[in-house]
């Protein structure tokens, strides 16, 4: 297993609709054709694999399971969007990138993006 640098923004504020987007960029040492990206959330004394995607370079990301994530790739950048977030989901979201093929296997883990989620204020009752 060889180490690889992964960069991601330090802080992102989710939209009022509970959507947060950030870029995960990795310094690929070679010409990887198969890449796996995992988003981990570290907060509340938990480590959760939020979503994971495997993609072939140049193709769309295919997320596994009931994913709350979507994303696109462009070169060594992955644009990730996490949906359905609530205030209690605020935490450190870490981007983990694995170059699966061809060998050698490379692993990179970012420092994390602190995502802040603020639940929208309920609309006041209206007489209209």
């Amino acid at each position: 297993c060889k180490a690889m640098h992964v960069a991601q923004p330090a802080v992102v504020l989710a939209s009022s609709r509970g959507i947060a987007s950030f870029v995960c960029e990795y310094a690929s040492p070679g010409k990887a054709t198969e890449v796996r990206v995992t988003v981990l959330r570290q907060a509340d004394s938990q480590v959760t694999e939020v979503c994971a995607a495997t993609y072939m370079m140049g193709n769309e990301l295919t997320f596994l399971d009931d994913s709350i994530c979507t994303g696109t790739s462009s070169g060594n950048q992955v644009n990730l969007t996490i949906q359905g977030l609530r205030a209690m989901d605020t935490g450190l979201y870490i981007c983990k990138v694995e170059l699966m093929y061809p060998p050698p296997y490379y692993l990179g883990i970012g420092n994390g993006t602190q995502i802040y989620v603020i639940d929208p204020e309920p609309c006041p009752d209206s007489d209209f």
């Epitope: 959330r41 907060a43 509340d44 938990q46 959760t48 694999e49 939020v50 979503c51 994971a52 596994l64 399971d65 009931d66 994913s67 709350i68 996490i82 359905g84 977030l85 209690m88 989901d89 935490g91 979201y93």
Partner: nanobody, 124 residues
Framework: EVQLVESGGGLVQAGGSLGLSCAAS????????MGWFRTAPGKEREFVAA????????SYADSVKGRFAISRDNAKNTVYLRMNNLNAEDTAVYYC?????????????????WGQGTQVTVSS
Amino acid sequence: EVQLVESGGGLVQAGGSLGLSCAASGRSFSMYAMGWFRTAPGKEREFVAAISGSGTLTSYADSVKGRFAISRDNAKNTVYLRMNNLNAEDTAVYYCAARSGWGAAMRSADFRSWGQGTQVTVSS
């Protein structure tokens, strides 16, 4: 809704291992994320581990990461919790729970179906 029955609890010495099982009855087991929670004497219910519908995603409490492993067999409608290197702080009633869909954080309020629990006692 899914009905859940836990098994495998018991008395084990500190440093030992134990395996819990949770059998689910009902349809579409693979549509549910499954979790384990525990309640220790005098403490609130605590998240332990969870696994997504197809078993590709997991979540662990910091206190058990590296010692406990969650897995599932969708063909058998069963979720498992393998517990290694147990210590006295792991003594609790362990509950299996189910929720629809996955999430960024694991909270008991998001789990709608619960088993009756199985007692795990670690003696030192």
